[in-house]
């Protein structure tokens, strides 16, 4: 039997081609030159190597480039990127948006892996800022990426990127992030008609101010309770009972089940009890009839 470290006669790879898919792992190790592999990386993705075979090719590249791969190799990694560890990726210096796109394409349609997260981090740090082109690329591949950014970083997100965002992508956004994203969404969807606009803007409403909620209440939108419960408390408090009734439409009955939770609880405390009674839901905790409500913040502003 041939010594496993020696390449069998006639099997030395002259180029990276499909004949190599029928090589055993030890044959790949023995018969493929690392420098040849590096110069023909663009061919690897077109060849259906198994992931075990890709491990062998990765090992060859690791030996050739112990300090990290050059971008000319990184750009053509293709499925070999899936075999990289975050530690491998931290050695890279990725500056080209085309390289980033090529690697994100490999993982397209799947959750952001630790490799991808590390790659994005390396790329953004290398660029020094989150420019429009980078954000367009990242939100196109990972709309949920928005919620991993700070409000300061989000301020540079172009409204055009908002179109790619799905409701579930905002699940992890906190109110401070939605405060930044909402005006962008409002701008992005401004030319849509009422019902279509509401469908698109709905998941961003956690950043909406009172005046926008008042405006929506005039448009028969029938907001569901789940959306209502995610609204900013300070934006809900000034709404009248009539406005909330119009905003929720048939879903207004759901207020009863949520009367002990924010923002419903705090909103109830601000309403006159007779106004709440008009809903016929048995909501309790409003301001009793005959009591005078002083708005101390207004009084302070006047003095």
């Amino acid at each position: 039997e041939v010594e496993k470290t020696a390449c069998p006669s006639g099997k030395k790879a002259r180029e990276i081609d499909e004949s190599l898919i029928f090589y055993k792992k030890w044959e790949l190790e023995a018969c493929v030159d690392a420098a040849l592999l590096a110069t023909q990386m663009d061919r690897v993705n077109a060849i259906p190597f198994t992931y075990e075979q890709l491990d062998v090719l990765k090992h060859k590249l690791d030996e050739l480039y112990p300090q990290g791969y050059p971008e000319s190799v990184i750009q053509h990694l293709g499925y070999l990127f899936l075999k990289m560890s975050p530690e491998d990726i931290r050695k890279w210096n990725v500056t080209s948006l085309e390289t980033l796109k090529a690697l994100l394409e490999v993982n397209k349609g799947h959750e952001m892996s630790p490799q991808v997260a590390t790659l994005i981090d390396r790329f953004v740090k290398g660029r020094g800022q989150l420019d429009k082109d980078t954000l367009d690329t990242l939100t196109a591949f990972y709309p949920g990426y928005l919620c991993s950014l700070s409000p300061e970083e989000l301020s540079s997100v172009p409204p055009s990127s908002i179109w790619a965002v799905r409701p579930q992508d905002l699940d992890t956004c906190d109110p401070r992030q939605l405060d930044v994203l909402y005006p962008k969404a409002r701008l992005a969807f401004q030319n849509m008609n009422g019902s279509e606009y509401f469908v698109k803007i709905q998941s961003f409403l956690g950043g909406a101010p009172t005046e926008d909620l008042k405006a929506l209440s005039q448009q028969n939108v029938s907001m569901d309770l789940a959306t209502f419960m995610k609204l900013r408390t300070d934006a809900v408090l000034p709404l009248t009972v009539a406005e909330v009734q119009k905003l929720l439409g048939p879903h207004v009955e759901g207020l009863k089940a949520e009367e002990r939770h924010r923002p419903v609880r705090d909103w109830i405390l601000r309403q006159r009890q007779d106004d709440l009674d008009t809903l016929g839901l048995g909501l309790q905790g409003g301001i009793p009839n005959g009591y005078l409500v002083l708005d101390l913040s207004m009084q302070e502003a006047l003095s």
Epitope: I47, P48, T50, Y51, E52, Y79, L82, K83, V106, N107, G109, H110, E111, S113
Partner: nanobody, 116 residues
Framework: QVQLVESGGGVVQPGGSLRLSCAAS????????MRWVRQAPGKGLEWVSV??????YYADAVKGRFTISRDNSKNTLYLQMNSLRAEDTAVYYC???????????WGQGTLVTVSS
């Protein structure tokens, strides 16, 4: 996860034909490539054929005799084996790998015996 189940193996005379099937289920949308791999008695694994997108590949030993195909609507991989020889006797395994998880999946195998 992807589950693979092979069928169609059996005993056949030299020169005869068999058609193997491999039914895939689970996260089939993420499959990147599918393969037929065989293991003859007392030997190691040998790649037989691969289908990758619309491209097909064959080991020299089966070229011109075996045909790999895939029916995406049925999530099934096939191997049509003609002009069978005694040296084709082996357990034939279906293999698939997926994008995202970068994992290989294997079926349980189906035995093909070529004997007169």
């Amino acid at each position: 996860q992807v589950q693979l189940v092979e069928s169609g193996g059996g005993v056949v005379q030299p020169g005869g034909s068999l058609r193997l099937s491999c039914a895939a289920s689970g996260s089939t949308f993420s499959i990147r490539a599918m393969r037929w791999v065989r293991q003859a008695p007392g030997k190691g694994l040998e790649w037989v054929s691969v289908i990758y997108g619309s491209s097909t590949y064959y080991a020299d030993a089966v070229k011109g005799r075996f045909t790999i195909s895939r029916d995406n609507s049925k999530n099934t991989l096939y191997l049509q084996m003609n002009s069978l020889r005694a040296e084709d006797t082996a357990v034939y395994y279906c293999n698939a790998d997926t994008i995202g998880t970068a994992r290989d999946y294997w079926g349980q195998g189906t035995l093909v015996t070529v004997s007169s």
